[in-house]
Each structure stands twice: as C-alpha cells, then as structure tokens.
Interface confidence: medium
Amino acid sequence: VPIRQLHYRLRDEQQKSLVLSDPYELKALHLNGQNINQQVIFSMSFVQGEPSNDKIPVALGLKGKNLYLSCVMKDGTPTLQLESVDPKQYPKKKMEKRFVFNKIEVKSKVEFESAEFPNWYISTSQAEHKPVFLGNNSGQDIIDFTMESVSS
C-alpha cells in the first residue's frame, strides 16, 4: 500500500545544514550560496507508531538514496546511523522500530525523538563539520531543527 511521503531540508537552530559526507555519515555545517545544494533532502514517511497531538511517528530517508536514519545500541549507547535498505521494500507504513522517530513540534521548531530509545534525539554539535548523532538532550547539543519543504 503506498505510503505518504513529504520532502524536506532540515537545518539546526544555528542554521547549520546537513550534508552527506561519506557514504554513511551526515555532518552539520554552515553552507553559503555556492554550495547550498549540497544539503541533503529528507524523504519523510508517515509510519507505524503512536501518534498524539504533539508527536507524529515518521521515518527519515535520504531522497534518491536507499538510506534511512536508524537508531541502534552500540557499546551500550543509543547510536544514530545511516542504514542501507532494499528499495523494493522501503519505505513501508510498518517500518522496523529502529527507523521510527517521533516528530515533535515545539513552537516553530521540530525535534526528532527515537521511538526505540525515548528521550534520545537527533542532535548536532555546536561545532562545525561534526557528525549528526543521537543525543539525550544534555549540555550544549542542539536538538531543534527547522524544516523547509521541497516540492516532489
């Protein structure tokens, strides 16, 4: 059954863009006019999970690539990774739990909480050129993003 997908660019609240740096890593950095088109476009799928007034379960794929953000336990710590998937199978409305994020809208910003690991969020560092990671909203890490809609 076809699944509803929308396409977005994400920037953290410091206006850092997200860029695919090596085949399986996202980094956050400020882009200028010339290289603005380097930022990734996310395909957001609306998937199985528990929606509520403030949380919507979504999966985040990279448009044009068979890659999805997923959350797994590595060395005892919830970890964000880019996972390669079979394009004939994905996206689907019932994604494995590791692919599911609760999209939480806070004022004009949005946060992405791991469904597998509650209170762990897609995060960026204050510093430039650092990997996007899964953080537990501690210290100076950034968990608030803005979404810019991209026409399909």
Epitope: V1, K93, K97
Partner: antibody
Framework: QVQLQQWGAGLLKPSETLSLTCAVY????????WSWIRQPPGKGLEWIGE???????NYNPSLKSRVTISVDTSKNQFSLKLSSVTAADTAVYYC?????????????WGQGTLVTVSS | QSVLTQPPSVSVSPGQTASITCSGD??????AFWYQQKPGQSPVLVIY???KRPSGIPERFSGSNSGNTATLTISGTQALDEADYYC?????????FGGGTKVDIK
C-alpha cells in the same frame, strides 16, 4: 461510534467464489486501512489482506492468487472475493479497521460471517 | 512464511499472574500487538505497539517485546480473563497472527 457490518453468502459449493461485503458506519473512511481476517472452526486467526481508500492492496502470500479486495468509497464499503473455494476455506470471516492511532493495527472488527464450503 | 509461535495453553489461579509468550525471528525489531477473543465473539485489541493499552482495557494487562519474544502479562487474573489470546505482527508486506493461547483460570 464506529461500526462494521458485514454480509454475504454463508454456504458455498467447492470451486465457487466467496463474496463478502463490509459497510463502515461512523468515522472517516479515507483515514484508515480496511482488512479481512478469517478463522476456521476451532482454529486460529489468519490475516487475508488489506485495502486503503484509493484501492491499493496488500495480500497474504498464501492466498494472493485467489483473493481480490475492492473498495467503494461512495458507499463506505469494502469487499472480499475468494475464488475456487474448498472445504479448507470454511471459516468465520471478519472485516476490520486498521487505525493510525493504534499503530496501524486492527482496532474495530465486524461481527463475523460463517462461510461453509460443502458439496 | 513468517511464523509467530505461542504456547497452546496457559493455566493460572485467580489472582495470580499469567504470562503468554509469542516468539518469532527478530520479533523485537517490530511492533507486537495482542488480541483477546472469547467464544463466539470478535477479537478485542488489548495491547498495541508492544506495551500500550487501548482505553477501556484494565491496567492488569501489560506487554513487552524484545529480542525474539513478545510477552503479554495479566496480573491479578480474573475469571473474565479466560479467553484465547493472539499475538499479531507484520512481516514485510503482510500481517501474521500467532497460533493463539487459551488461558484457563483454575
């Protein structure tokens, strides 16, 4: 309050086609998936397939070659057809709604229709 | 086809705890659901998304899911909990029920 009311022929001969319809009363039709499940006498539940309001379907691979699920959004109804039935298809057939608020699982069920296949 | 395996029956004394297991390959990667079915009635959803309870379902029903096993737990079992219980999950593009477990209240 959502209600699913189902009907169809209860007695079939082998090789005939089973045909059931489920009408949905209350709630939006387009916001959900609509499923058929069956239960042979004294046995467990078996998922047959699902459809959305646009007519897109998923079927159980073991039944796929014989099953057709269709939808009539103007009447808020969906239907099941199962061809070339045998005695093994004797079961109570249920229609059900899959809702996003329960994680796309079956939260409302019809009353069930016993279909007997016998020569 | 994907298989979800449940014990055929579980026997429990009133007021005790009944645990029903459902095992399947990497079931913990997916969401598990549980239905209660009494004789002559349609199934009723008692647990969804591993551990959530629909409104109207008593607190004594709880669920968990990790590894290859989902578990439905009924704490302080009552006579009215005597029924068949089915686990339910998905396998790629289709849905699968477990074989069902009959809970007998001794």
């Amino acid at each position: 309050q959502v209600q699913l009311q189902q009907w169809g022929a209860g007695l079939l001969k082998p090789s005939e086609t089973l045909s059931l319809t489920c009408a949905v009363y209350g709630g939006s039709f387009s916001d959900y998936y609509w499923s058929w499940i069956r239960q042979p006498p004294g046995k467990g539940l078996e998922w047959i397939g699902e459809i959305d309001h646009s007519g897109s379907t998923n079927y159980n691979p073991s039944l796929k070659s014989r099953v057709t699920i269709s939808v009539d959004t103007s009447k808020n109804q969906f239907s099941l057809k199962l061809s070339s039935v045998t005695a093994a298809d004797t079961a109570v057939y249920y229609c059900a709604r899959a809702s996003p608020s329960s994680g796309w699982t079956l939260d409302y069920w019809g009353q069930g229709t016993l279909v007997t296949v016998s020569s | 086809q994907s298989v979800l395996t449940q014990p055929p029956s579980v026997s429990v004394s009133p007021g005790q705890t009944a645990s029903i297991t459902c095992s399947g390959d990497k079931l913990g990667d997916k969401f598990a659901f549980w239905y209660q079915q009494k004789p002559g009635q349609s199934p009723v959803l008692v647990i969804y998304l591993d551990n959530k309870r629909p409104s109207g379902i008593p607190e004594r029903f709880s669920g968990s899911n990790s590894g290859n096993t989902a578990t439905l737990t009924i704490s302080g079992t009552q006579a009215l909990d005597e029924a068949d219980y089915y686990c339910y999950a998905w396998a790629d593009t289709y849905e699968v029920f477990g074989g069902g477990t009959k809970v007998d209240i001794k």
